[in-house]
Interface confidence: low
């Protein structure tokens, strides 16, 4: 017996109930891909989610988070709230980094400062809460009678932690 | 304080279906999602879904999610989940739990667990 | 799905010993990683959220570590309640993963 569903295309369900015909979505449902048996509930925005994609027969609605709240996880599954920079959140809401540490961004937690005598460099310019340090040329570059062609090390990128 | 009261033991015949529960106390029930998680003997966890028990939306881990439905009664309190056509690979403990905090921000992380169903599968 | 790889599977130590577990994720997961503990017969619980935050009560010789896919809880000092069974997960993403979970014995 060949199975009629394979002919129902996105947007419709295969109804058993009514001899494998196709029938649309109800409302507030979608199906993405042809021969499905059911449509699924559509996502929905509510609470600090906001719709960024309204949903149709053939694909979900897509989710933002509200002013104050960004996405976390594929397809925004979840939304966590901001924080300042040189701040991570924490179970009691956002907190300064501590000293030493640094946040550059209004999500993630803070990560220390970037050690520069581990690559054999000096401070350049001092780390902040909101700001890592920057490396500069090694002492012995600084010393009198070195050469001064090398140029100081970049800052890493924001967002990067310590190698 | 938070309690997730879940039954000891459930014995299941193949393919008949179970529906296990867990009765939420100390909290509010509808601000807090619930989360269903699958422990097989001496094996690693396993997430099945969770559900917001305020509106029941769900969210499934697609490998569950044509055996799994997941639902609550708000008047009692308790959530539940129903397995359809168990195998015998699904003799296993089955958890509910909590998120820690309410709302946003939320970690996302299981704060408050059950002390577990075990699901024998066998005839 | 993001699998999340725990190692190692086992391991014994003395009591007052210093021991480490590594979980590393497939993909990055920006530090949302938690660490549970579960002893025998029991059910898990929360040591460690955001990858190096203790959860409330968790005793000060547990830390995390780690950023991008790579993680680690360590445990200075074991005493004899921290035996146990120790799962990461990852809530990056749904769905959240579990590692295969690392059971420490004593030696």
């Known amino acids: 017996l060949q199975d009629l569903c394979s002919n129902c295309p996105a947007g419709t369900f295969c109804d058993n109930n009514r001899s494998q015909i196709c029938s649309p979505c109800p409302p507030n449902s979608f199906s993405s891909a042809g021969g499905q048996r059911t449509c699924d509930i559509c996502r929905q925005c509510k609470g600090v989610f906001k719709t960024r994609k309204e949903c149709s027969s053939t694909s979900n609605a897509e989710c933002d988070c509200i002013s104050g709240y960004h996405c976390l996880g594929a397809e925004c599954s979840m939304c966590e709230q901001d924080c300042k920079q040189g701040q991570e959140l924490t179970k009691k809401g956002c907190k300064d980094c501590c000293f030493g540490t640094f946040n550059d961004q209004k999500r993630g937690i803070c990560r220390p400062w970037t050690n520069c005598s581990l690559d054999g460099k000096s401070v350049l310019v001092n780390g902040t809460k909101e700001r890592d340090v920057v490396c500069g040329p090694s002492p012995a570059d600084l010393s009198p009678g070195a050469s001064s062609a090398t140029p100081p090390a970049p800052a890493r990128e924001p967002g990067h932690s310590p190698q | 304080q938070v309690q997730l009261q879940q039954p000891g033991a459930e014995l299941v015949r193949p393919g008949a279906s179970v529906k296990l529960s867990c009765k939420a106390s100390g909290y509010t029930f509808t601000s807090y999602w619930i989360n269903w998680v699958k422990q097989r003997p001496g094996q690693g966890l396993e997430w099945i879904g969770n559900?917001?028990?305020?509106?029941?939306?769900?969210n499934y881990n697609q490998k569950f999610k044509d055996r799994a439905k997941l639902t609550v009664d708000k008047s009692s309190s308790t959530a539940y989940m129903q397995l359809s056509s168990p195998t015998s690979e699904d003799s296993a403990v089955y958890y509910c739990?909590?998120?820690?905090?309410?709302?946003?921000?939320?970690?996302?992380?299981?704060?408050?667990w059950g002390q577990g169903t075990s699901v024998t599968v066998s005839s | 799905d993001i699998q999340m790889t725990q190692s190692p599977a086992s391991l014994s130590a003395s009591v007052g010993e210093t021991v480490t577990i590594t979980c590393r994720a497939s993909g990055n997961i920006d530090n949302y990683l938690a660490w549970y503990q579960q002893k025998q017969g029991k059910s898990p619980q929360l040591l460690v959220y955001?990858?190096?935050t203790l959860a409330e009560g968790v005793p000060s010789r547990f830390s995390g570590s780690g950023s991008g896919t790579e993680y680690s809880l360590k445990i200075n000092s074991l005493q004899p309640e921290d035996f146990g069974s120790y799962h990461c997960q990852q809530y990056w993403t749904i769905p959240y993963t579990f590692g295969g979970g690392t059971k420490l014995e004593i030696k």
């Open positions: 559900i917001f028990p305020s509106d029941s939306y769900t």
């Open positions: 955001n990858a190096k």
């Open positions: 739990t909590r998120f820690g905090s309410s709302g946003y921000p939320d970690y996302y992380t299981m704060e408050y």
